[in-house]
Amino acid sequence: MMTGTIETTGNISAEKGGSIILQCHLSSTTAQVTQVNWEQQDQLLAICNADLGWHISPSFKDRVAPGPGLGLTLQSLTVNDTGEYFCIYHTYPDGTYTGRIFLEVLESSVAEHGARFQIP
């Protein structure tokens, strides 16, 4: 039975040209996290594997940095970075947990962070 929940940074916004940290946290389970995949819509951005460490997709290497922790840092943001991001936690023995973050990249200097929320 999957008892865990994923807490994410929720709906967030950031300025064009700036950077943002995407964070997810798995709680309420003793399952072992074997790997976390980060996806942007239908693109694999990065993977953090418990044994192998980080792999950043080559096409994102210039603008994506691993961490902090299991999170992901997006740099040199453009308006095209606006959209959904997913953290996919592969765990044993529970299985897969998925969290969703919506990022809006703003032209203006006003960028508010949304409230944290949980996805069961």
Epitope: L44, H55, P93
Partner: antibody, heavy 118, light 107 residues
Framework: EVQLLESGGGLVQPGGSLRLSCAAS????????MHWVRQAPGKGLEWVSS????????SYADSVKGRFTISRDNSKNTLYLQMNSLRAEDTAVYYC???????????WGQGTLVTVSS | DIQMTQSPSSLSASVGDRVTITCRAS??????LNWYQQKPGKAPKLLIY???SLQSGVPSRFSGSGSGTDFTLTISSLQPEDFATYYC?????????FGGGTKVEIK
Amino acid sequence: EVQLLESGGGLVQPGGSLRLSCAASGFTFSSYSMHWVRQAPGKGLEWVSSISSSAGYTSYADSVKGRFTISRDNSKNTLYLQMNSLRAEDTAVYYCARVPYDVWLDYWGQGTLVTVSS
Amino acid sequence: DIQMTQSPSSLSASVGDRVTITCRASQSISSYLNWYQQKPGKAPKLLIYAASSLQSGVPSRFSGSGSGTDFTLTISSLQPEDFATYYCQQSYSTPLTFGGGTKVEIK
């Protein structure tokens, strides 16, 4: 240099058993998921089974479930496939492959031929 | 199970030609799509992983694109050593499944 070397193939009668081995070298074997893939003569590739780095998780194709068992010995850098109740349709070249991040099969062995025939 | 459909099943081309092979998944697989090259009597060789990432040591004339359900492998200028069979494979979910293969032959 990454190397995977399969062994244990051969001719076996229907209903018989074989154990395939895959000896790994040139990388930290215990950090990688490993898979078996087979290819019947003149046919395409068919995934058979996988095992996680610590051997905590295994998975099988429906066609072999209950008959084949994948295992590994990280102290010996070796992957195994125990094949029981073999059928004619199991005749194929069996490849072991290294699978970083459980996504792509980046190194393959040269394959070992299993022939099931009376 | 996710079905992978490759087309064409075979094609004839000349050295220097631009070759395109397509692969369609029966459901969305994000970018969990890999391409392999296999020559007769040899093991498959990884060319492209995660839809568009070029495996180390693979010539840059090979490229991959697509996401969701539709993917493409392109060889920009076919070389004599590229005549082989090419397979796509999804790793979105188990069982892992392969396309039926595309045999690239000399015209």
